[in-house]
């Protein structure tokens, strides 16, 4: 009686269980009663990443430099190429099909996490006691200057965008 289900690494065709091709190889011909499944390796710029019965391999992804992309990991016959973005850019999606420039943190905000090829800059508001007076993709919030340690006094309070202004202490008249 012909099988209705096949074991792992097999597929059902013409009432018969045939062996699947291993990752990295494509189907050339199905098995018969007398012959095994025939498979051949994918070409130089192709891959198949699963046990399969595909008659064509998939093309490796192209990391287009015009879109700011570069190769992070070269593809093999079993894996696709992995793209990442050039310096100063990050991917717009998980599949990394194009890149955009990293966001800068505006004055009053500092960099919480520097951007990578796959993630954008994460900014955070400068808390009390810290400031950022520049628009930057790298700079963290900096602490206000401590006037006391310089034997000075605060002449102008700091904000999240400006440092405190220190000045000399008023000498008390005799």
């Amino acid at each position: 009686e012909p099988p209705t289900a096949c074991r792992e690494k097999q597929y059902l065709i013409n009432s018969q269980c045939c062996s699947l091709c291993q990752p990295g190889q494509k189907l050339v011909s199905d098995c018969t009663e007398f012959t095994e499944t025939e498979c051949l390796p994918c070409g130089e710029s192709e891959f198949l990443d699963t046990w399969n019965r595909e008659t064509r391999c998939h093309q490796h992804k192209y990391c287009d430099p015009n879109l700011g992309l570069r190769v992070q990991q070269k593809g093999t016959s079993e894996t696709d190429t992995i793209c990442t973005c050039e310096e100063g850019l990050h991917c717009t999606s998980e599949s990394c099909e194009s890149c955009v420039p990293h966001r800068s943190c505006l004055p009053g905000f500092g960099v919480k996490q520097i951007a990578t090829g796959v993630s954008d800059t994460i900014c955070e508001p400068c808390p009390v006691g810290f400031f950022s007076n520049v628009s930057s993709a790298f700079e963290k919030c900096r602490p206000w200057t401590s006037c006391e340690t310089k034997d000075l006094v605060v002449q102008q309070a700091g904000t999240n965008k400006t440092d405190v202004v220190c000045g000399p202490q008023d000498r008390q008249r005799a």
């Epitope: 012959t35 095994e36 025939e38 498979c39 016959s77």
Partner: antibody, heavy 121, light 107 residues
Framework: QVQLVESGGGLVKPGGSLRLSCAAS????????MSWIRQAPGKGLEWVSY????????YYADSVKGRFTISRDNAKNSLYLQMNGLRAEDTAVYYC??????????????WGQGTLVTVSS | SYELTQPPSVSVSPGQTASITCSGE??????ICWYQQKPGQSPVLVIY???KRPSGIPERFSGSNSGITATLTISGTQAMDEADYYC?????????FGGGTKLTVLG
């Protein structure tokens, strides 16, 4: 019974050339993918090259790429290995073998007796 | 380049079960063949596609493959099974052999 017989081995100087032949009998040669495998004295098996039924798909080991050429003549039931630029490390017994199916689903189910190639000055 | 690693030698008493391993990265993602080679002879295919036996190969030869290890098992080992055993797989567009394991049947 199914038979593969290699010939053409011998002593050759480094940089020299040799052409190995493998004569197939008692099976339909054109139905099978074929390989050359070698074994250095006292060492393990090393795959050399692979050719499809029609000869349109060919693979080589990195160690012989650009120096060795595999070919076949289905009308003569013969497999060949042209070896140029021979080096001392090519010294080995060379086997031709039949693959029971294309690619990884197969296995080399019939081997010749081997022919010895010695590269020495 | 891809490598298959085998123990250089395995010993077994007659009638016992011999297990020869072959390990490699993502090996379970490949089909494995096993060859037997006796001194002065050409190799003989004993297992292909992980577990299939060509005609004429005794039932005491069996194979399995999972994860990073493939195993050739010879149950009820006989003196005539003493030989070198090689695993083999395809990787990309090349065929790769393991370094071989010498099986010694004691006694």
């Amino acid at each position: 019974q199914v038979q593969l017989v290699e010939s053409g081995g011998g002593l050759v100087k480094p940089g020299g050339s040799l052409r190995l032949s493998c004569a197939a009998s008692e099976f339909t040669f054109s139905d099978y993918y074929m390989s050359w495998i070698r074994q250095a004295p006292g060492k393990g098996l090393e795959w050399v090259s692979y050719i499809s039924r029609s000869g349109d798909t060919i693979y080589y080991a990195d160690s012989v790429k650009g120096r060795f050429t595999i070919s076949r003549d289905n009308a003569k039931n013969s497999l060949y290995l042209q070896m140029n630029g021979l080096r001392a490390e090519d010294t080995a017994v060379y086997y031709c073998a039949r693959d029971l199916a294309a690619g990884a689903t197969g296995g080399l189910d019939c081997w010749g007796q081997g022919t010895l190639v010695t590269v020495s000055s | 380049s891809y490598e298959l690693t085998q123990p250089p030698s395995v010993s077994v008493s007659p009638g016992q079960t011999a297990s020869i391993t072959c390990s490699g990265e993502r090996l379970g993602n490949k089909y494995i063949c096993w060859y037997q080679q006796k001194p002065g002879q050409s190799p003989v295919l004993v297992i292909y596609q992980d577990f299939k036996r060509p005609s004429g190969i005794p039932e005491r030869f069996s194979g399995s493959n999972s994860g990073i290890t493939a195993t050739l098992t010879i149950s009820g080992t006989q003196a005539m099974d003493e030989a070198d055993y090689y695993c083999q797989a395809w990787d990309s567009r090349t065929v790769v052999f393991g370094g071989g394991t010498k099986l010694t049947v004691l006694g």
